[in-house]
Interface confidence: low
């Protein structure tokens, strides 16, 4: 009798991390059934013992939020899922080693685009994360990534774009034609960790020039 293949019950056990929200996800294998239950454990790299995650024991959903448990930026983590089918078969699969700093992806920034007659102003709002400092306050992406900067682009027409960038939060594209529509894209860049966020996009129209009416 050949040993059971864990992938029959359980596949693709991995962390999906975005802005330091760390979610463990997995898929059921071909032998998985709706009544298969899953139990989750995690541990810090270098530790011997696994810790059962409260709220993620004998669950039927295929995700578990481990943000709090994996919230130390200086540590590496593992998680594992044990699947148990109604028929009593079980399988356990472990994640690759997880570093939130290395593996988290960046969501688009939160931006306010403001139309003026001959300019468009863009204000980037700080991006909070679930990571907390020692005094309890939530850290922003800027607190964590020291070389983070913003890259802004304004599509003027099919062939011409204007670019701005920097660490500051307020930008303005000047010299624009009144009463004209423009497409703005804003991205977060972190060169040393080779990270780029998905772009925030705003379609804005400069105000009409009332001085001549």
């Amino acid at each position: 009798h050949a040993p059971e293949d864990p992938s029959d019950l359980l596949q693709h056990v991995k962390f999906q991390s975005s802005n330091f929200e760390n979610i463990l996800t997995w898929d059921s294998g071909p032998e998985g059934t709706p009544d298969t239950v899953y139990s989750i454990e995690y541990k810090t790299y270098g530790e011997r013992d696994w810790v059962a995650k409260k709220g993620c024991q004998r669950i039927t959903r295929k995700s578990c939020n481990l943000t709090v448990e994996t919230g130390n930026l200086t540590e590496l983590y593992y998680a594992r899922v044990t699947a148990v089918s109604a028929g009593g078969r079980s399988a356990t699969k472990m994640t690759d080693r997880f570093s939130s700093l290395q593996h988290t992806t960046l969501k688009p920034p939160d931006v306010t685009c403001i139309s003026k007659v001959r300019s468009i102003q863009m204000i980037v709002h700080p991006t909070p994360t679930p990571i907390r400092a020692g005094d309890g306050h939530r850290l922003t992406l800027e607190d964590i990534f020291h070389d983070l900067f913003y890259h802004l682009e304004l599509q003027v027409n099919r062939t011409y774009q204007m670019h701005l960038g920097g660490k500051q939060r307020e930008y303005e594209f000047f010299g624009l034609t009144p009463d004209t529509e423009f497409l703005g894209t804003i991205m977060i860049c972190v060169p040393t960790w080779a990270k780029e966020s998905a772009p925030y996009m705003c379609r804005v129209k400069t105000l009409p020039d009332r001085t001549w009416t």
Epitope: L73, T74, S99, L101, Q102, A133, G134, L139, D143, I144, H146, D147, G166, K167, Q168, P191, T192, W193
Partner: antibody, heavy 123, light 110 residues
């Protein structure tokens, strides 16, 4: 209170190596970006190198890139600077420094300084 | 290695106001609000006075203030006291996480 104590300086010849250490206490070391700053006799300070809280990202002054390596051991609350192929122009007092608070980078200002350790490179 | 430009020396009269300038480029002072000022007394490590252009460090008297215009930052000391006689250094973030200091200014209190 915050204490930073540097050690490992001394007199060496050009081309030699030295390893500086900085023992930190009085604060949560693992939450602080750490830097080395040097000051040559009669000159102004010069930022040399910085290291992210994780130790995974390091920053260097152009003239020391490839020769100096900054590292940290958060379990031992210690910062290191490995200096290879030393040159006479590396002669300076080397300070271990931190920014004003946790999760702040070096460019937020250098609030806490050790007393420094003197490195002399001369033949 | 790049350095910000400061006057080598300035002097001021007891009780009066003095300003020390620090000139950089659009790649440092001009683009970023990460200018710091340090005071150094003989034989001691530098002491942080001002960071983020105009934020006073804990323990810095409110006689010290910082400002920035274009590529130039300034430290203003009002109500000069004899203990203010020292070397003053500016510093700024520079693109790609470098941090550059000025050459220093010696303040003499007359």
């Amino acid at each position: 209170q915050v204490q930073l104590v540097e050690s490992g300086g001394g007199l060496v010849q050009p081309g030699d190596s030295l390893r500086l250490s900085c023992a930190a206490s009085g604060f949560t070391f693992g939450s602080y970006f750490m830097s080395w700053v040097r000051q040559a006799p009669g000159k102004g300070p010069e930022w040399v190198s910085g290291i992210h809280i994780s130790g995974g990202i390091t920053y260097y002054l152009d003239s020391v890139k490839g020769r100096f390596t900054i590292s940290r051991d958060n379990a031992k609350n210690t910062l290191y600077l490995q200096m290879n192929n030393l040159k006479p122009e590396d002669t300076a007092v080397y300070y271990c420094v931190t920014p004003p608070g946790p999760f702040k980078a070096h460019y937020n200002g250098m609030k806490y300084w050790g007393k420094g350790t003197l490195v002399t490179v001369s033949s | 290695n790049f350095m910000l430009t400061q006057p080598p020396s300035v002097s001021g009269t007891l009780g009066k106001t003095v300003t020390i300038s620090c000139t950089g480029t659009s790649r440092d002072i001009g683009d970023y609000n990460y200018v710091s000022w340090y005071q150094q007394l003989p034989g001691l490590a530098p002491k942080l006075l001002i960071y983020k252009v105009n934020t006073r460090s804990s323990g810095t008297p409110d006689r010290f203030s910082g400002s920035k215009s274009g590529n130039t930052a300034s430290l203003t000391i009002s109500g000069l006291q004899s203990e203010d006689e020292a070397d003053y250094y500016c510093a700024s973030y520079r693109l790609y996480a470098d941090y550059v200091f000025g050459g220093g200014t010696h303040l003499t209190v007359l």
